[in-house]
């Protein structure tokens, strides 16, 4: 049920919805407060509790740090006193909102303290090659829960220039396909940008020794990475997916890009990076199956296949919602999710997993759906539905609320109801209450109308009376009624003459140049406003500011000067506030002016 | 009630002119056009032309054309028909008559007729 | 201009007699016809238009059939007052023409 915005002066209490949480991953730098984010609505007031990683957290009661807790609020804000305080807090942590109408529940919140970023010391050797090798230089950056950047520069600041024969790799090696005597430098420097600490560290540079060679002998392709001939990939629906084939040889391989299994999507496909990287955008299902890169020069290829399996996050098919019930119904939430692998859906109630609940809970599970049947008041809870597989988790609160309400009829009492004999009319009596209230309409006598089989009632309440007659003129009493309570409301129905053309106007051939005349009486019932109209070919005809063309009155349209564009169909239109009727003539004009 | 009230008789000399008037009342003067009719004695009814009172538009018979003037003075709801050059066969009495509610160029209301002497 | 001729020119009858008066035009008028009646004196009366169709507040023993050039008036049952001469005009095409008249007169 849903209590219209007319049914007022019953106080009705909310179940607690989380209006605002933290996100699901949280990182936290050294120099950072941690602000735990959890509001939630309802009435009564909403009280908060904190889990981290299952257990009962107080942020209160922890010591060494100072806490803020917002008013009316689940959220918090931890300041530490020293820059390592954050490592302590790491942990998955779930807010609970309660009042005495259930518990709803915050998603997991990951919160991952990112230390101050340190590249381990260590001695860098010099790395000797001769000329027309290839090599790697290696960068290892240190692990971080954000996303960084890599670049290579020297000691001057310089980017290296990278093209076919020298790439930067997506893990942030430095590849040389083959080297030359000009790569000799004694100052490759990786540096590693961490955007969330807005600090920049580097590496210790790496001294590149190329020994000069007389006879630099060629090389078929061979690849730096993927170094196996293939590797099975999961990609996730919906995000990017990259692939990437770095080779060596001499001369410089070149790399292409193939798809055994079908065509490449060409509208969502980038190479970047010369070739050697390959960006598929948004991936789908569609793009499952084997990429396939080939490294070749002159002298021969070498070949990596990517076998790519598209899986999911959990998606919502049909995401549970709250409602209100009354006394006797069937509450049903439907928790339908999909995903690849199918995500596993558990449910709790009040945020307790119901294999926790005792066994003669009212509640079954069917086929990804809560139902509970003859719900009463003491059955109100919120439910969560939560699905999971190796790829995320979603979580969906929802409340069944059971409520007990008067029945109210929301029509306003003593309404009048105009309509014309042979019509419909229809009485209104919008009725509300939980249980539902049971409607009936009684005539003057108390009689119930529908003893005639021209009284017809909906569901809504409104009673129909069709084939409208003269004496169905009165008084109707409409007797709403649940369980609490029953109310009455009356209405009076007038039943008014219908409105008659008595003359309509009459078809006709008239000359171009000439005009012609068109009449329409009509009968109306004398207690109502009469108004004839007139439309042509389906619009409204006007007498048109200073144009001559038409003269309409009383009853009378004349069009003057007439040409072929005026011939068509011309209605006269009888109409009160209470009914419309219309009669059709048609004008056909001929040839040969008339005066 | 629909009234058309005609000016008195005249008597004229030939080739003099006269001016006949039709006061109308009890509708909308400019809703309907005005047509003027003349009948000599003994005789049958002849259409001279006719006048459309809200924008002064005319049709004329030709056997009249260049001796009739239809006008009409919408502040006090009347037309005018004046003949000129007149001739002893113009003896008749002339009338003024409303376009037909329910069709146009006949004729539901009529004047009372003015007699117009043409006599030397 | 279209040449209307009506018959009889004149015409005897007594009351409750039914009597028919024709009106000829020298080509297809498509319907646009009317009758007046005319007593001495006084400015005619519309009787019928279109042919067809009586003017209200008409007598319903007053009736117009007819088309293309040929049409009647019909009286079914003459009444004292309906003696007075008779008019069919045309209108389908400028000069509106009128018929010469037929005089219906008491036997």
């Known amino acids: 049920i849903q209590i219209p915005e007319e049914y007022e002066g019953h106080h009705v209490m909310e179940p607690p919805v989380i209006t605002e949480q933290s996100p699901r991953r949280l990182v936290v730098f050294p120099t950072d407060d941690i602000s735990l984010k959890c509001e939630a609505s309802g009435k009564p007031e909403v009280q908060f509790r904190w889990t981290r990683d299952g257990v009962h957290f107080k942020p209160k009661e922890e010591l060494g740090v100072t806490v803020y807790q917002s008013p009316h609020s689940g959220s918090f804000t931890i300041t530490g006193n020293n820059s390592n305080f954050a490592q302590r807090f790491q942990g998955i942590y779930r807010c609970f909102a309660s009042n005495k109408l259930g518990t709803a529940m915050s998603h997991e919140i990951r919160l991952m303290a990112e230390g101050a970023p340190k590249w381990p010391k260590e001695t860098v050797k010099p790395v000797e090659v001769e000329e027309g090798e290839s090599v790697v230089l290696p960068c290892n950056p240190p692990p971080s829960a954000e996303p960084l950047r890599i670049y290579w520069m020297n000691s001057k600041i310089l980017h290296i220039k990278q093209d076919e024969r020298v790439t930067m790799g997506q893990n942030g090696n430095l590849y040389f396909a083959n080297v030359l005597t000009s790569d000799n430098h004694s100052d490759y420097i990786c540096h590693a940008h961490f955007p969330g600490t807005r600090t920049i560290i580097q590496k210790e540079p790496i001294d590149l020794r190329v020994k000069a060679t007389n006879s630099m002998i060629d090389r078929k392709p061979r690849l730096l990475f993927p170094t196996n001939s293939s590797s099975h990939l999961v990609a996730l629906q919906g995000q990017p997916l990259v692939l990437e084939c770095i080779a060596e040889g001499f001369p410089t391989p070149t790399i292409k890009w193939l798809r055994p299994s079908g065509p490449m999507p060409a509208d969502r496909v980038t190479y970047q990076n010369h070739n050697k990287t390959l960006q598929l955008l948004k991936v789908g299902e569609e793009d499952d199956g084997e990429y396939r890169c080939l490294a070749e020069n002159s002298l021969g290829s070498a070949r990596h296949a990517y076998y790519v399996t598209v899986e999911a996050a959990p998606y919502w098919l049909h995401k549970p919602q709250s409602h209100l019930y009354g006394p006797g119904e069937t509450a049903r939430l439907d928790c339908q999710v999909q995903g690849r692998p199918q995500p596993e859906v558990t449910w709790r109630i009040n945020g307790i997993p119901v294999e926790e609940l005792a066994k003669d809970q009212k509640y079954r599970i069917q086929r990804g759906a809560l139902i509970l049947s003859n719900v009463q008041p003491s059955d109100t809870m919120v439910t969560q539905c939560e699905a999971r597989n190796r790829h995320g988790l979603l979580l969906a609160n929802a409340y069944i609320y059971v409520v007990q309400l008067p029945a109210k009829i929301l029509t306003a009492d003593n309404q009048t109801y105009m309509a014309v004999q042979g019509s419909t009319a229809y009485l209104l009596c919008k009725a509300f209450g939980a249980p539902v209230p049971s409607v009936q309409w009684l005539d003057e006598d108390g009689t119930t109308v529908l003893q005639d089989e021209r009284f017809f009632p909906y569901a809504n309440g409104t009673l129909g009376i069709r084939d409208l007659q003269a004496n169905d003129t009165g008084r109707y009493f409409c007797l709403a009624a649940n369980d609490q309570n029953n109310v009455t409301i009356m209405a009076n129905l007038k039943v008014k003459d219908a409105t008659q053309i008595t003359q309509g106007p009459r078809s006709t051939i008239e000359k171009k140049g000439s005009r012609v005349t068109f009449t329409c009486q009509a009968s109306f019932d004398p207690s109502l406003q009469p108004s004839i109209t007139w439309r042509g070919d389906g619009r409204d005809l006007q007498e048109l500011g200073d144009s001559d063309k038409y003269f309409i009155e009383d009853g009378r349209l004349v069009i003057h000067s007439l040409d072929y564009s005026d011939q068509g169909n011309y209605s006269c239109v009888a109409s009160t506030e209470l009914d419309v009727v219309e009669s059709r003539a048609q004008l056909l004009v001929v040839g040969s002016p008339g005066p | 009630q629909v009234q058309l009230v005609q000016s008195g008789a005249e008597v004229k000399k030939p080739g003099a002119s006269v001016k006949v008037s039709c006061k109308a009342s009890g509708y909308t003067f400019t809703g309907y056009w005005m047509h003027w009719v003349r009948q000599a004695p003994g005789q049958g009814l002849e259409w001279i032309g006719e006048i459309n009172p809200s924008n002064g538009r005319t049709n004329y018979n030709e056997r009249f054309q260049g001796r009739v003037t239809l006008t009409v003075d919408k502040s006090i709801s009347t037309a005018y028909m004046e003949l000129s050059r007149l001739r002893s066969d113009d003896t008749a009495v002339y009338y003024c008559?409303?376009?037909?509610?329910?069709?146009?160029?006949?004729?539901?209301?009529w004047g009372q007729g003015t007699l117009v002497t043409v006599s030397s | 201009d279209i040449q209307m001729t009506q018959s009889p020119s004149s015409l005897s009858a007594s009351v409750g007699d039914r009597v028919t008066i024709t009106c000829k035009a020298n080509?297809?008028?498509?319907?646009?016809l009317a009758w007046y009646q005319q007593k001495p004196g006084k400015a005619p009366k519309l009787l019928i238009s279109?042919?067809?169709n009586l003017v209200t507040g008409v007598p319903s023993r007053f009736s117009g059939s007819g088309s293309g050039k040929d049409y009647t008036l019909t009286i079914s049952s003459l009444q004292p007052e309906d003696f007075a001469t008779y008019y069919c005009q045309q209108y389908w095409s400028t000069p509106f023409t009128f018929g010469q008249g037929t005089k219906l007169e008491i036997k």
């Open positions: 008559a409303r376009d037909y509610y329910g069709t146009s160029y006949n004729f539901d209301y």
């Open positions: 080509e297809d008028i498509n319907n646009r």
């Open positions: 279109g042919a067809t």
